[in-house]
């Protein structure tokens, strides 16, 4: 708490300007009117206040708006935003994308702070869903944003928003998240032709089921090994050697380098060695000729 003291004669602030950096903390408390500060918040950003001085200014705003700041003030907080706690931010009602952008700009280049995470959460909840413009904005500032959401949160992303997603935005997504995003991407890109469709859907294929991979194998897509290695193991296992060959096209030669890694390793174990040999890559570990392949999952379903 800053002690209440009378403002010295002639020091009452008529406007928020650079002369205030020469005020001591108690002078700022005594001489700056909170309502004046609220209406001239945009000027604070251009003034090199110390952190201690910013504490005083924040205290004045807190007293003026105990229930939370109005958006007109929030939009112009500038670097005073860095002084806000998640508890402060939970009191806000941020509805304008411009306000969100202004505050994300302040934190640009830094890791997502608890304040920013709370701000985004408040904003998205207020909107009811993660629309395209919001997603555009968030992934521009935080490419990993999408992958920080739970599968439940991702379920509120409308398919139309998927157009805003760039491949790098999905780099840190795990299979559970891609399981949610893939069907949305499939819906979003459904009217595109073969090659264009593949370019767009490629980053989401970590959530694709076997049937969709089989369908892609009929379209000469030439999937690269990096994409293949991110596919769900359970989706890859039922693919035949011929289907994998068609799916990868000229990239099929890359299987040799990956034969000890999932999903390639597990897929090899499910193929007949005869079939693997047709690839001419020297892949070993397939089912020897003359052995009977039992589909145990099918047997369990029947019993």
């Amino acid at each position: 708490e800053v002690e209440k003291t009378a403002c010295p004669s002639g020091k009452k602030a008529r406007e928020i300007d650079e002369s205030l950096i020469f005020y001591k903390k108690w002078e700022l408390e005594a001489c700056v009117d909170a309502a004046l500060l609220a209406t001239q918040m945009d000027r604070v950003n251009a003034i090199p206040f110390t952190y201690e001085q910013l504490d005083v200014l924040k205290h004045k705003l807190d007293e003026l708006y105990p229930q939370g700041y109005p958006e007109s003030v929030i939009q112009h907080l500038g670097y005073l935003f860095l002084k806000m706690s998640p508890e402060d931010i939970r009191k806000w009602n941020v509805t304008s994308l411009e306000t969100l952008k202004a505050l994300l700009e302040v934190n640009k280049g830094h890791e997502m702070s608890p304040q920013v995470a709370t701000l985004i959460d408040r904003f998205v909840k207020g909107r009811g869903q993660l629309d395209k413009d919001t997603l555009d904005t968030l992934t521009a500032f935080y490419p990993g944003y999408l992958c920080s959401l739970s599968p439940e949160e991702l379920s509120s992303v409308p398919p139309s928003s998927i157009w805003a997603v760039r491949p790098q935005d999905l780099d840190t997504c795990d299979p559970r998240q891609l399981d949610v995003l893939y069907p949305k991407a499939r819906l979003a890109f459904q009217n595109m032709n073969g090659s264009e469709y593949f370019v767009k859907i490629q980053s989401f294929l970590g959530g694709a089921p076997t049937e969709d991979l089989k369908a892609l194998s009929q379209q000469n897509v030439s999937m690269d090994l990096a994409t293949f290695m991110k596919l769900r193991t359970d989706a890859v296992l039922p693919l035949t050697v011929a289907e994998v060959q068609k799916l990868l096209g000229p990239h099929v030669e890359g299987l040799k380098a990956e034969e000890r890694h999932r999903p390639v390793r597990d897929w090899i174990l499910r193929q007949r060695q005869d079939d693997l040999d047709t690839l001419g890559l020297g892949l070993q570990g397939g089912i020897p000729n003359g052995y009977l392949v039992l589909d145990l999952s099918m047997q369990e379903a029947l019993s």
């Epitope: 950003n45 251009a46 003034i47 670097y79």
Partner: nanobody, 114 residues
Framework: QVQLVESGGGLVQAGGSLRLSCAAS???????MSWYRQAQGKQREPVAV???????SYADSVKGRFTISRDNAKNTVYLQMNSLKPEDTAIYTC?????????WGQGTQVTVSS
């Protein structure tokens, strides 16, 4: 990141003048540029500030003697110090706010001998 390079400090007789300069290398828009000083055993204090609008303000102790100015094209701020006194002896450091972040220079020593 904003890199700040100060120059112009040195040893001067009381009553003499010095001109400090601070060049900021950045593509960001600069909001304000200011000079602070810290005398030995004392806290750092603001000396002068100039905003992006060109308005200036000074500490009472230097009013009428020091002038702050900036060259926006060169992203440089200057501090013209006249009628220097021994109590002006300190390390003078440049401070810049660019895109809502504050950056400090390394500081330049100013020594005023009586």
């Amino acid at each position: 990141q904003v890199q700040l390079v100060e120059s112009g400090g040195g040893l001067v007789q009381a009553g003499g003048s010095l001109r400090l300069s601070c060049a900021a290398s950045t593509t960001s828009s600069i909001n304000s540029m200011s000079w602070y000083r810290q005398a030995q055993g004392k806290q750092r204090e603001p000396v002068a500030v100039i905003t992006d609008r060109g308005s200036t303000s000074y500490a009472d102790s230097v009013k009428g003697r020091f002038t702050i100015s900036r060259d926006n094209a060169k992203n440089t701020v200057y501090l013209q110090m006249n009628s220097l006194k021994p109590e002006d002896t300190a390390i003078y450091t440049c401070h810049v706010i660019a895109d809502w972040r504050g950056y400090w220079g390394q500081g330049t020593q100013v020594t005023v001998s009586s």
